[in-house]
Each structure stands twice: as structure tokens, then as C-alpha cells.
């Protein structure tokens, strides 16, 4: 069963090491894939005492634990490296942290990407 | 520590059912997708069952599709399989799996029987 | 249906390499697929070896390694101990929510 599934055809680009790896530092990445499979959005990012450091962002490939997230959001607890996926066009051009502790109530930390 | 604790096993006649539960402590259990896995005694693993992060897709093995469901309780943190029209094939260990990015197995729990037998 | 087929049975002496591979009946195994490895002893839960075809699990040894093989998911092991003595189970990701087990490996080392 699939409930309300968005197709993702395109994400928003983004590589902070795009001259060692030779691609283009920001854009639209279409994203490609075998027709049976779903395809993904992802951004990761680094904080840097309170800055944020955008590591990478694109096209993901079918992965269970990306479905049913229209936005993209981290919520494991101070990961050193953070990491979102989500479904739907260009719907990693923002993303969020928002730490969900088991006991804890959640805080917000939305961050807009301003590569 | 993540833990994954299942219960419901037991010993059920053929066209019987039985729920299992998965209760799970650790992580943030409404963040992760899961899945059931099973092993037949002196057998392979065998996927049985996934569900997605918020409960709205669900995918399963098609020898039980139509007989099992699985479903999630994101406020209780625990995930469920309902097992109907159990057949002796379907006896076996039930594991249940966190599942994380890259659609691997991260986490197990210990398993529990499930014996189908007259 | 997608059949994953792995060798039934391996056997390696202590100290040697071995080199287990995960094939499938519809075509060549890819990272797209995200193999992962899983080590079993009878009695016990899967331990988690290998994901996303090379990644070594936390606290796994860096004896244990995955690649691709030609068409297949490879796990080498180096330096074989006694206790890697178990069974050895891939999973490909088909995609769609859908996870297929490969029948198992059971590993021996001799002596």
C-alpha cells in the first residue's frame, strides 16, 4: 500500500568539493533511475560552531527510509554530519534539524540553504 | 543502546492468527522505517515485511500478502505484525529489523517463535 | 520472482581468505542494489557485517570487506578465525520497499 506518493524528477545541486570532483558547484540535478524504483532528494551539512556547512545536495536512489517525507529533515540527535531525504521535486532546497530525543520535546532549527 | 524487544509468539492451530509486537527503545523510533524477518527452523532468512517512517506504505513477501499486515504505533514505539490464515510454512522465528538509510538491516531483535501446527 | 543465490557451503583454513558472493536470476548486481552482509550463528540474531556494499558496520573487524565482483556483491574475509565460523547471509534492496535474502553460506574453517 502507498498512500500519496510524489514523484521525484529533479533536486536541487549542490557540492561544496565540486572542483576536486569536477562537477558544477549548484543547480538542478535531474534525477535518473530504473523505472520499478522510486527516486529521492537528500542535502547533509555540517555545523560549524552555529554555522552551517552544506556538504552536499542532489538526487538520492530509491531508499525505504527516505518514503513518505515531503520535507527534508534530520532528527537523529547531534549527528556529526547531518543528513535529510525527502520526496518530491526540489524538496531538499530547504531542510531542517530537528532533534527528537525519546523523552524530550522537539526544538526547530529550519535552515534555508544559501549556497 | 537500541533495543528490539518481540512478543506474541506461540503455538497456533493452521487458519489461526497472532499478533506480534516489536517494542523499541534507543532511537528515534518514528524516524526509522522497519521490517519483519523470518527463519524457518534449520532454514534461511527470509524478508517478510516493511513499513515506511510514518506508517503509510507497507510492502510484504507475497507468499503473505493478503494474510499479514504491518503497522506501526509511533506514540507506543512499537511495531506490529498481524499474522491471519497461518499456515505450518508460516512457523518460524520472527525477527524485527530497524532499518536504516541505504535499506540495510542496522538492528535485530532477538526473535520470537511462531509454531503453526494441529 | 527475484532469486539471490549464494554459495550453500564454504570452507577456509584458519588464517586463509575466502571470498563469498551474492548473485541474482534477473541481472548483474549493482550498488544501486545496496548489498549488505549479515553474519549468523546458530541460535543467535544476525549480526550486521556490511551495507551499501562496502561499509563496515561499527565494531565489525577490517578483516571482513565488501565489494562487487564482476555481476555479484563479494564479502572477503582475510585472515579467517575459528569463530568466523557461521552462517552468511546478502540482502539486495530491489527497490519499492522490497528486500530479497540470499539462501545463505555456511561458512567452515578447518583445523
Known amino acids: 500500500a502507498i498512500l500519496g506518493r510524489s514523484e521525484t524528477q529533479e533536486c536541487l545541486f549542490f557540492n561544496a568539493n565540486w572542483e576536486k570532483d569536477r562537477t558544477n558547484q549548484t543547480g538542478v540535478e535531474p534525477c535518473y533511475g530504473d523505472k520499478d524504483k522510486r527516486r529521492h532528494c537528500f542535502a547533509t551539512w555540517k555545523n560549524i560552531s552555529g554555522s552551517i556547512e552544506i556538504v552536499k545536495q542532489g538526487c538520492w536512489l530509491d531508499d525505504i527510509n527516505c518514503y513518505d517525507r515531503t520535507d527534508c529533515v534530520e532528527k537523529k540527535d547531534s549527528p556529526e554530519v547531518y543528513f535529510c531525504c525527502c520526496e518530491g521535486n526540489m524538496c531538499n532546497e530547504k531542510f531542517s534539524y530537528f532533534p527528537q530525543m525519546e523523552v524530550t520535546q522537539p526544538t526547530s532549527n529550519p535552515v534555508t540553504p544559501k549556497p | 543502546e537500541v533495543q528490539l524487544l518481540e512478543s506474541g509468539g506461540g503455538l497456533v492451530q493452521p487458519g489461526g492468527s497472532l499478533r506480534l509486537s516489536c517494542a523499541a527503545s534507543?532511537?528515534?523510533?518514528?524516524?526509522?522505517?522497519m521490517s519483519w524477518v523470518r527463519q524457518a527452523p534449520g532454514k534461511g532468512l527470509e524478508w517478510v515485511s516493511a513499513?515506511?517512517?510514518?506508517?503509510?506504505?507497507?510492502y510484504y513477501t507475497d507468499s503473505v500478502k493478503g494474510r499479514f499486515t504491518v503497522s506501526r504505533d509511533n506514540s507506543r514505539n512499537t511495531l506490529y505484525l498481524q499474522m491471519n490464515s497461518l499456515r505450518a510454512e508460516d512457523t518460524a522465528v520472527y525477527y524485527c529489523?530497524?532499518?536504516?538509510?541505504?535499506?540495510?538491516?542496522?538492528?535485530w531483535g532477538q526473535g520470537t517463535l511462531v509454531t503453526v501446527s494441529s | 520472482q527475484t532469486v539471490v543465490t549464494q554459495e550453500p557451503s564454504f570452507s577456509v583454513s584458519p588464517g586463509g581468505t575466502v571470498t563469498l558472493t551474492c548473485g541474482f536470476n534477473?541481472?548483474?548486481?549493482?550498488?544501486?542494489?545496496?548489498p549488505s552482509w549479515y553474519q549468523q550463528t546458530p541460535g543467535q540474531a544476525p549480526r550486521t557485517l556490511i551495507y551499501?556494499?562496502?561499509t563496515r558496520s561499527s565494531g565489525v573487524p577490517d578483516r571482513f570487506s565488501g565489494s562487487i565482483l564482476g555481476n555479484k556483491a563479494a564479502l572477503t574475509i582475510t585472515g579467517a578465525q575459528a569463530d568466523d565460523e557461521s552462517d552468511y547471509y546478502c540482502?539486495?534492496?530491489?527497490?519499492?520497499?522490497?528486500?530479497?535474502f540470499g539462501g545463505g553460506t555456511k561458512l567452515t574453517v578447518l583445523g
Open positions: 534507543g532511537f528515534t523510533f518514528r524516524n526509522s522505517a
Open positions: 529489523a530497524k532499518v536504516y538509510y541505504y535499506s540495510f538491516f542496522d538492528y
Open positions: 551499501n556494499t562496502n
Open positions: 534477473s541481472g548483474s548486481v549493482s550498488t544501486s542494489y545496496y
Open positions: 513499513i515506511s517512517v510514518t506508517g503509510g506504505s507497507t
Open positions: 540482502v539486495l534492496y530491489m527497490g519499492s520497499g522490497i528486500h530479497v
